[in-house]
């Protein structure tokens, strides 16, 4: 089945924004909301925000979770408020990161 094509006047949703891209804002408006988790060198990074352009979110949202990154996407006002992205498997300890507790 073919991917759903973006509408000419796509609906925009209000999303919770928490992370590096947000500046002083706590929300953003986009065609999709997301909640993400990535692990860098034992450092857990949780962020929330929005994809303002359909194509921008299309690839990211369809990427299956990996041991180091997971993104959950949704459509609907504030739909990412109570979503916390989870990794598919229990994290493995990285070399030299004994100070960090990994899930």
């Amino acid at each position: 089945m073919e991917d759903e094509k973006p509408k000419v006047n796509p609906k925009l949703y209000m999303c919770v924004c928490e992370g590096l891209s947000c500046g002083n804002e706590d929300h953003c408006e986009g065609q999709q909301c997301f909640s993400s988790l990535s692990i860098n060198d034992g450092f857990h990074v949780y962020q929330k925000g929005c994809f303002q352009v359909y194509e921008q979110g299309k690839m990211t949202c369809k990427t299956p979770p990996s041991p180091g990154q997971a993104v959950e996407c949704c459509q609907g006002d504030w739909c990412n408020r109570n979503i916390t992205a989870q990794l598919p498997t229990k994290g493995k300890s990285f070399p030299g990161t004994q100070n960090f507790h990994l899930e």
Epitope: E18, G19, L20, C22, D26, S38, N40, D41, F43, H44, V45, Y46, Q47, T84, G96, T97, N99, F100, H101, L102, E103
Partner: antibody, heavy 117, light 111 residues
Framework: QVQLVQSGAEVKKPGSSVKVSCKAS????????ISWVRQAPGQGLEWMGL????????NYAQKFQGRVTITADESTSTAYMELSSLRSEDTAVYYC??????????WGQGTLVTVSS | DIVLTQPPSVSGAPGQRVTISCSGS????????VSWYQQLPGTAPKLLIY???KRPSGVPDRFSGSKSGTSASLAITGLQAEDEADYYC???????????FGGGTKLTVLG
Amino acid sequence: QVQLVQSGAEVKKPGSSVKVSCKASGGTFSTHAISWVRQAPGQGLEWMGLIQPRFGTANYAQKFQGRVTITADESTSTAYMELSSLRSEDTAVYYCARDYYGGMAYWGQGTLVTVSS
Amino acid sequence: DIVLTQPPSVSGAPGQRVTISCSGSSSNIGQNYVSWYQQLPGTAPKLLIYDNSKRPSGVPDRFSGSKSGTSASLAITGLQAEDEADYYCSSWDLLSKSRVFGGGTKLTVLG
């Protein structure tokens, strides 16, 4: 909007300890790392360490290892930085900041700690 | 313990373009993201650039970041009087498991 509000200025004697608090409001507290950074008068930024509240474990800069303790209280959404064996060189403004690995997005207003006999 | 190297000062006239360099090593900038901060006198640092080249919402596009190998740079175009501040680069160091900063660069807007 995420806000980090720090405790007030402190004057301490050499050899004593200081504990600075950083209360977060807005957003989720437990899932985000908090870094502590200090700035001596007229000097640059110096990273001291961080805590990931969800896991309760901290990571410290080698320079401060054994002298700094960073903790977090999830029930009050507050992070703490305690520095012991204070000396005059520890006189600085101490900042807490939300750390996202790729950068620090939200900063507290800073707490001036003066160490003087 | 300054690990990243920045020039102590740069200057430029209003409207001009200035760049601030930040040099590190393979254990930090070479393998990790670089972020840039602006600090106005008496205030907390403010995030200008994250993930090497991305701008947070609200930061003017006059500010841009780039990275090549173990060095990074911040460019400011259309210099304005309010850009006069201290600028710091930062990265995560894989060897020391710590965040590292540059010594800071004081930007002076002439005239």
